[in-house]
Interface confidence: low
């Protein structure tokens, strides 16, 4: 339904508080280097303008699109060219090209300082002194570091962030109350950002059809009692929401997400029996809860899939009549019967089914040709099952840190050209699959593990896309969204790689390592491990283990020494020499 003023429409729908928060997120996700104060100023100007349009929708400029209004506002930033370089050229373009240009300049790895957490008392004072500014700063800092963060969900995180400070700044032991909550928000936030990044990559790199297929599979697993038409409706609406958010249309996205939550709750009887609790919550919590809701129970006595999709004489007729709908029905029927499969596996099966029909429906005897199509699924199902079994056994044997190290070595040998920080970050995250998924029973392991790995490998893909260095990574990332993980799994040691020159500086450590947290110390050691493999790609597991054990002992010894710095200097030289000898460098 058309509105005279889009900005007035969204302001009224969302309310002033959410409107301002979403505009701040949008601006921070576009101009990631701008100071907080500049963004606040821009947001206030837009908000004042929106209020004039609410008062009179016919007022000057109120009929302009949100992209035009926001783009015009961003292009008033004085230091655009100095700060962003060629991004300033976007401002010479007209909509919609200008917005597309801004989107292309979003940076997944912006050169921003690490967020350092101040002392609890300092944070509580800042919270009490100016709660509004404190919370805006949170939105700003997260949005600029995560330019694809799902904006309506970030509002939910901000609400929890505020609740944590409200409760804990009054507690007897503020730190004991607050720090675990902030840690949880940080970890959940990183996971949420990465999951949304995959959705946006799916839409932007592989198109709406790919996203819709993913959504059909996931929603059919989650809502197996819902009819196909109902799932189709939800998929269409969900696709619109994510297309908007990934496209920077955050006001429309938040508004449509609220409408979708309302629709789901009004129709929960025909969607899922698990929605009752979610639907009793306030809006932000409700939407989050629905997105995370557990799978409903499968309907009893579902008939065999073979009848409609293999045995029926009408398979090719139905396929020809409406290919995507027929494949959608296949995916729906298969997914609702298999909550134990990963979404990407279900999509591989659907792709195999589609390829078979394409071939067989043109054959002399179609039925004879596609009669055994379900037999082709067996190896596709067994491959991730076996991989997860092996890796969970390895995880249980090694524990998380050493499991991460095994993956670091494995992936560095596969793609040694990738930067060390990226290899460390991605391998550490890949390694977390163990503690996240291996504890689950068999029926839940594959959806947990393989769909999580898809999210992590997408991080590798988006980071690599910014500065491509490996044809193998580019190939695995771009050829097929659902086959990324099998593609990376299948990579062997890169025999074409020329080992890196040995640089003693890379392996020189100082006393500051002793004051680092356990996590940061691990990262230092894992960085050294990656560099070792880059110097000596043919090193055996045993050789690398010996060097890493020596390294751990060296750090422990020097951190206990009276003169730590001297110890690191002298013992470090010995360690480097011993390592070179052990690895034959």
């Amino acid at each position: 339904d058309a509105h005279k003023s889009e900005v007035a429409h969204r302001f009224k729908d969302l309310g002033e508080e959410n409107f301002k928060a979403l505009v701040l997120i949008a601006f921070a996700q576009y101009l990631q280097q701008c100071p907080f104060e500049d963004h606040v100023k821009l947001v206030n100007e837009v908000t004042e303008f929106a209020k004039t349009c609410v008062a009179d929708e016919s007022a000057e400029n109120c009929d302009k699109s949100l992209h035009t209004l926001f783009g015009d506002k961003l292009c008033t930033v004085a230091t655009l060219r100095e700060t962003y370089g060629e991004m300033a050229d976007c401002c010479a373009k007209q909509e919609p090209e200008r917005n597309e240009c801004f989107l292309q300049h979003k940076d997944d790895n912006p050169n921003l300082p690490r967020l350092v957490r101040p002392e609890v008392d300092v944070m509580c004072t800042a919270f009490h002194d100016n709660e509004e500014t404190f919370l805006k700063k949170y939105l700003y800092e997260i949005a600029r570091r995560h330019p694809y963060f799902y904006a309506p969900e970030l509002l939910f995180f901000a609400k929890r962030y505020k609740a944590a400070f409200t409760e804990c700044c009054q507690a007897a032991d503020k730190a004991a109350c607050l720090l675990p909550k902030l840690d949880e928000l940080r970890d959940e936030g990183k996971a949420s950002s990465a999951k949304q990044r995959l959705k946006c990559a799916s839409l932007q790199k592989f198109g709406e059809r790919a996203f819709k297929a993913w959504a059909v599979a996931r929603l059919s697993q989650r809502f197996p009692k819902a009819e196909f038409a109902e799932v189709s409706k939800l998929v269409t609406d969900l696709t619109k929401v994510h297309t908007e958010c990934c496209h920077g249309d955050l006001l429309e996205c938040a508004d449509d997400r609220a409408d979708l939550a309302k629709y789901i709750c009004e129709n929960q009887d025909s969607i899922s029996s698990k929605l009752k609790e979610c639907c009793e919550k306030p809006l932000l919590e409700k939407s989050h809860c629905i997105a995370e809701v557990e799978n409903d129970e499968m309907p009893a006595d579902l008939p065999s899939l073979a009848a409609d999709f293999v045995e029926s004489k009408d398979v090719c007729k139905n396929y020809a009549e409406a290919k995507d709908v027929f494949l959608g029905m296949f995916l729906y029927e298969y997914a609702r019967r298999h909550p134990d499969y990963s979404v990407v596996l279900l999509l591989r099966l659907a792709k195999t089914y589609e390829t078979t029909l394409e071939k067989c429906c043109a054959a002399a005897d179609p039925h004879e040709c596609y009669a055994k199509v379900f037999d082709e699924f067996k190896p596709l199902v067994e491959e991730p099952q076996n991989l997860i079994k092996q890796n969970c056994e390895l995880f249980e044997q090694l524990g998380e840190y050493k499991f991460q190290n095994a993956l670091l070595v494995r992936y560095t040998k596969k793609v040694p050209q990738v930067s060390t920080p990226t290899l460390v970050e991605v391998s550490r995250n890949l390694g977390k699959v163990g503690s996240k998924c291996c504890k689950h029973p068999e029926a839940k392991r594959m959806p947990c593990a393989e769909d999580y790995l898809s999210v992590v490998l997408n991080q590798l893909c988006v980071l690599h896309e910014k500065t491509p260095v490996s044809d193998r990574v580019t190939k695995c990332c771009t050829e097929s969204l659902v086959n990324r993980r099998p593609c990376f799994s299948a990579l062997e040691v890169d025999e074409t790689y020329v080992p890196k020159e040995f640089n003693a500086e890379t392996f020189t450590f100082h006393a500051d390592i002793c004051t680092l947290s356990e996590k940061e110390r691990q990262i230092k050691k894992q960085t050294a491990l990656v560099e070792l493999v880059k110097h000596k790609p043919k090193a055996t597991k045993e050789q690398l283990k010996a060097v890493m054990d020596d390294f751990a002992a060296f750090v422990e010894k020097c951190c206990k020494a009276d003169d730590k710095e001297t110890c690191f200097a002298e013992e470090g030289k010995k360690l480097v020499a011993a390592s070179q000898a052990a690895l034959g460098l």
Epitope: E227, F228, A229, E230, S232, K233, T236, N267, D314, K317, N318, E321, A322, V325, F326, M329
Partner: nanobody, 124 residues
Framework: QVQLVESGGGLVQAGGSLRLSCVAS????????MGWFRQAPGKEREFVAT????????SYADSVKGRFTVSRDNAKNTVYLQMNSLKPEDTAVYYC?????????????????WGQGTQVTVSE
């Protein structure tokens, strides 16, 4: 839920024509297979015609082939049944039905949603 409302029934002489309409409202979203069924007094409900969601696939009962035409306008959420060369044995209550899916459904159990029906009477 999906509501279906039929209209266009009435009294017509043998050899005459009628056009039935069925409007879907509520949660109407493609893909839906739409069907027409009829029930004469004292008889079972029987299949008349069905149309796939895109309108590309049609199917008719042998008794109405060549006389009845089913069509749909998805923009208006409406399905039509054009009935020509009507015979007294076409007298019945005509029901519109909807089912999510692809292909042609000829059995009542395949349909999830039903209208209240519209009376068609064909006199000699």
């Amino acid at each position: 839920q999906v509501q279906l409302v039929e209209s266009g029934g009435g009294l017509v002489q043998a050899g005459g024509s009628l056009r039935l309409s069925c409007v879907a409202s509520g949660r109407t979203f493609e893909p839906f297979v739409m069907g027409w069924f009829r029930q004469a007094p004292g008889k079972e409900r029987e299949f008349v015609a069905t149309i796939s969601w895109s309108g590309g696939s049609l199917s008719y009962a042998d008794s109405v082939k060549g006389r009845f035409t089913v069509s749909r306008d998805n923009a208006k959420n409406t399905v039509y049944l054009q009935m020509n060369s009507l015979k007294p044995e076409d007298t019945a209550v005509y029901y519109c039905a909807a089912a999510p899916g692809v292909g042609n459904y000829r059995y009542t159990f395949q349909y999830d949603y039903w209208g209240q029906g519209t009376q068609v009477t064909v006199s000699e």
